[in-house]
Interface confidence: low
């Protein structure tokens, strides 16, 4: 557990008056329909709110939408619907907000049936002004910004055309027809799949993968017999149909598709799927579905090339393609991921890894909790976390697990304590050390959010009744104060705070219901006067992440290095502030065999950390190759785990062997690739 002071819960002084002076109500002059909210830019305070209301008429539906803008983090809103000519905005496209602090916004309008194309409203000044633009096509997808240049947009049309704009949607050009899926890569590159015969669905498995690096002036076919493709970190993945049958395999490229390698993963059949669970520039977590409608599969973790994979976790819960998985990256501590497995008895259990998938364990039972009815042994059980799957099953779980990179070590989640996830009403648990230890934080289900980089946690009870009370904690969830933010309870619909958890403002959204109408209402509470002073050096304490044995010199070593952080003391009531930067100091650890994975053609026998040469290569190993051609594979059997920074210590260098073998996949041999220009 992270360092903190055990003390009686002290009340924050005069908080009611302080919060009352900083509570701002806004009633929207609007019939209740749906509402969507977007933050424009970082630390700008600009929020756009789009409300839509559908009036069903006998033959058709009449729609009405309103657009509101705040520039003070939601304390006040102005109706700016006239800036978009009172046009009805299509909510399924949402508000397309530009990357970084570009200030760009695109809204897609509803147009009448006979029109030649769609209509968009564009702003490049944080929604102060909008320009109406009529499109030469009907959009099928939301406009997608290039991550590198927010003036470059792409969209697919309802006719499967790929359209690109180079001037932030002012002028559009169709650069390719018959396109199924398009994605921006790095350096303004666009990857897309095309069909030759009937349609995307009919040609699945016979699609071609194309690339353009100059916004459609020239193209290169970089793959054939494609089922689908995906981008993750620096890796480009394609699932490719095998020559002889209906199975497909993953191929990977780290050079934008110029050269490919077959990933050493099992092939999948028609009813199965691959899914990239998480990826960064070092490695990828890949889920491979089991045959049959099992609802589970296997997680594999890659080497630094994305080629060699180690089995990470069996029976990983993942319902169907595009279905539900509980896989969660705990962003508040390096190397930590949480997910669910489906056990033999069909119960669902939570597992956690602290070393990027190297080992998985159950979550430690919170000290202040009893084992529930799912536990065979009332003294031995674990915490099980509710995530996407529980939410999809309509359990009483209003929110998925929450962590923030700048609130170091903090993880908040709904859970139950037993042998498996329980269908009973869950409680809210918190970890302050990245998932090693847990404490019950709140009884029953709640909405929760993190403010001021962890300096404040805010929660609202999940209830079917109207509410008017918010809870907050200034000590990482140990002690809670309650504040009545309105005399008239509202039907609560959501908590909104600026992404990044740096803000001290929270907006409570809901609606009021009277006899004839219901109206949207928001209450924005600014906690700045609760945290009245800026934090100083004395408010922080040193914390060693991943520490499990302080007596061990290698304590805290994960992936070859340890990190010490400056953490806010639980007893300090002060502002980290918007400019707060996590202070951390890494130090390198000595290498052990645990820092290496077994390279292609090698394996680890049970309970042994050494990599042993496989007596013979068989099955999919024999197909595995580099760059889609015959290749000399040289290896000493070990490869450092991606992202591992250890130095010295064990150096498992031994005789380098040639694993000469014929590559049986000529999926992407150079002669199959071709280039052409527009």
């Amino acid at each position: 557990s992270a360092p903190g002071e055990d003390e009686e819960c002290g009340r924050v002084r005069d908080f009611v008056a302080k919060l009352a002076n900083n509570t701002h109500q806004h009633v929207f002059d609007d019939l209740r329909g749906s509402v969507s909210l977007s933050w424009v830019g970082d630390s700008t305070g600009v929020i756009l709110v789009l409300t839509t209301f559908h009036v069903p008429l006998v033959i058709m539906t009449f729609g009405q939408s309103k657009l509101y803008r705040s520039e003070d983090y939601g304390k006040n809103f102005k109706d700016i619907t006239d800036l978009i000519n009172n046009t009805f905005i299509r909510t399924e496209f949402g508000m397309a907000i530009g990357p970084e602090n570009s200030g760009k916004v695109v809204l897609t309008a509803e147009v009448s049936g006979g029109s030649r194309g769609g209509r968009i409203f564009r702003s490049s000044d944080f929604a102060k002004n909008f320009v109406q633009t009529d499109l030469p096509f009907h959009p099928l997808t939301q406009m997608m910004y290039s991550p590198q240049n927010s003036d470059y947009l792409l969209a697919l049309s309802t006719e499967n055309g790929l359209w690109v704009s180079k001037n932030f949607g002012g002028k559009w050009e169709e650069i390719h027809k018959a396109v199924c899926l398009a994605k921006w890569g790095s350096d303004n590159t666009i990857f897309f799949t095309t069909y030759a015969n009937g349609s995307c669905k009919a040609d699945l498995g016979a699609l071609e993968l194309w690339r353009t690096s100059d916004l459609g002036k020239s193209f290169k076919t970089i793959g054939v017999k494609i089922y689908s493709f995906g981008l993750g970190g620096r890796f480009l993945f394609a699932s490719v149909m095998a020559d002889k049958d209906t199975t497909r395999r993953i191929h990977v490229s780290t050079d934008q598709g110029d050269t490919w390698s077959m990933a050493q993963l099992p092939s999948v059949g028609q009813e199965q799927f691959y899914s990239i669970l998480a990826a960064n520039d070092d490695m990828v977590f890949m889920h491979v579905d089991e045959p049959g409608d099992t609802g589970f599969g296997t997680i594999f973790t890659s080497d630094d090339r994305g080629i060699v994979y180690s089995k990470s976790l069996d029976r990983h819960l993942y319902t169907t393609t595009g279905g539900e998985t509980d896989f969660t990256n705990v962003t508040s501590l390096r190397g930590v991921y949480i997910t669910s497995v489906l056990s033999e008895d069909n119960s669902i259990q939570t597992m956690i890894t602290f070393d990027q998938g190297g080992r998985w364990t159950h979550l430690r039972k919170p000290e202040n909790s009893e084992c529930d009815a799912t536990a065979k042994n009332k003294n031995e059980c674990s915490l099980h976390i509710h995530a996407s799957y529980s939410i999809s099953q309509k359990l009483n779980v209003p929110m998925a697990p929450l962590s923030e990179p700048n609130a170091v070590g903090i993880v908040i989640a709904h859970g139950s304590v037993g042998d498996a996830i329980s269908v009973m009403v869950p409680d809210v648990y918190i970890s302050d050390d990245g998932g090693y230890s847990w404490t019950k934080m709140l009884e029953g289900p709640h909405y929760y959010t993190i403010l001021d980089s962890g300096g404040i946690i805010v929660a609202i009870e999940h209830s079917s009744r109207p509410i008017n009370v918010i809870k907050f904690s200034t000590d990482e969830g140990q002690c809670w104060q309650t504040y009545t933010f309105t005399r008239d309870p509202i039907y609560f619909t959501g908590l909104a705070s600026e992404p990044g958890a740096r803000s001290m403002n929270i907006s409570i959204w809901g609606f009021t219901e009277s006899f004839l109408t219901s109206q949207w209402v928001s209450y924005t509470i600014d906690f700045k006067d609760i945290l009245e002073r800026n934090c100083e050096e004395k408010d922080y304490t040193i914390w060693l992440a991943h520490s499990t044995d302080p007596e061990d010199y290698e304590d805290g070593c994960i992936l070859g290095y340890k990190e010490q952080f400056l953490r806010l003391r639980k007893s300090s009531v002060c502002q980290n502030g918007r400019d707060y930067v996590v202070t951390k100091q890494p130090s390198i650890c000595l290498c052990s065999l645990e820092d290496f994975l077994c390279d292609f053609g090698y394996y680890r026998p049970e309970n042994d950390s050494k990599c042993v040469e496989q007596p013979e290569l068989k099955g999919h190993d024999l197909e595995f190759c580099l760059y889609g051609r015959e290749e000399h594979l040289t290896t000493n059997g070990y490869r450092k785990i991606p992202g591992d920074k250890c130095q010295g210590g064990v150096n498992p260098v031994r005789e380098v062997k040639d694993l000469k073998k014929k590559c049986t996949s000529n999926f992407l041999s150079p002669e199959k690739q071709n280039s052409k220009s527009n």
């Epitope: 050096e537 951390k584 100091q585």
Partner: antibody, heavy 118, light 110 residues
């Protein structure tokens, strides 16, 4: 403002004892490991002792091991160095210092002079 | 016992950039050695400049920065000033014998 103020230095005979004190202010004393460092007449710096933030761990170089004892009183924000069996080579200016591991910056006191001579 | 070596003396001019280094006899200096840099001015006035390789102490001018250069720890003074004339010591942390100081570099600013 961070301040470390040493006291207790003196002229002492070989074999004698002396106790140095260091009063700390301006930072959370109980959060940091603290050290004693000495500067010998030839201007070399030598680390003499270190104590963990809570006082559980102490370490010394071989040159003073068994003769010097570092301790702290976190309630009084004070660091101590008990020196016994003093030798002429212990003659030096003694500094109380927050030498820093990963996450802090170093602070030094103004020093207190110890002379071991017959 | 590890030995920490520094340049015995360096001379620079006002406004110039000067880099002092700190070498370890046991091999490359890493972040795990938590290099500390200390300035000594006349009358035994010691000031901690840098801790943990690159953490500047509060109140220390931004022209002082710590880093690792090759296999050594380094203190760089960007735009040296006459008041920077002093002796600079580095201290390295070793897991088996704790803090070891270098012999100091006398910096002259002419």
């Amino acid at each position: 403002e961070v301040q470390l103020v040493e006291s207790g230095g003196d002229l002492v005979k070989p074999g004698g004892s002396l106790k140095l004190s260091c009063a700390a202010s301006g930072f959370t004393f109980s959060s940091y490991g603290m050290s004693w460092v000495r500067q010998t007449p030839d201007k070399r710096l030598e680390w003499v002792a270190i104590i963990s933030s809570g006082g559980s761990y102490t370490h010394y170089p071989d040159s003073v091991k068994g003769r010097f004892t570092i301790s702290r009183d976190n309630a009084k924000n004070t660091l101590y160095l008990q020196m016994s069996s003093l030798k002429s080579e212990d003659t030096a200016m003694y500094y109380c210092a927050r030498l820093c591991g990963p996450l802090c910056s170093g602070y030094w006191g103004q020093g207190t002079s110890v002379t071991v001579s017959s | 016992q590890a030995v920490v070596t520094q340049e015995s003396a360096l001379t620079t001019s006002p406004g110039e950039t000067v880099t002092l280094t700190c070498r370890s006899s046991t091999g490359a200096v890493t972040t795990s050695n938590y290099a500390n840099w200390v300035q000594e001015k006349p009358d035994h006035l010691f000031t901690g400049l840098i801790g943990g390789t690159n953490n500047r102490a509060p109140g220390v001018p931004a022209r002082f920065s710590g880093s690792l250069i090759g296999d050594k720890a380094a203190l760089t003074i960007t735009g040296a000033q006459t008041e920077d004339e002093a002796i600079y010591f580095c201290a390295l942390w070793y897991s088996n014998h704790f803090w070891v100081f270098g012999g100091g570099t006398k910096l002259t600013v002419l």
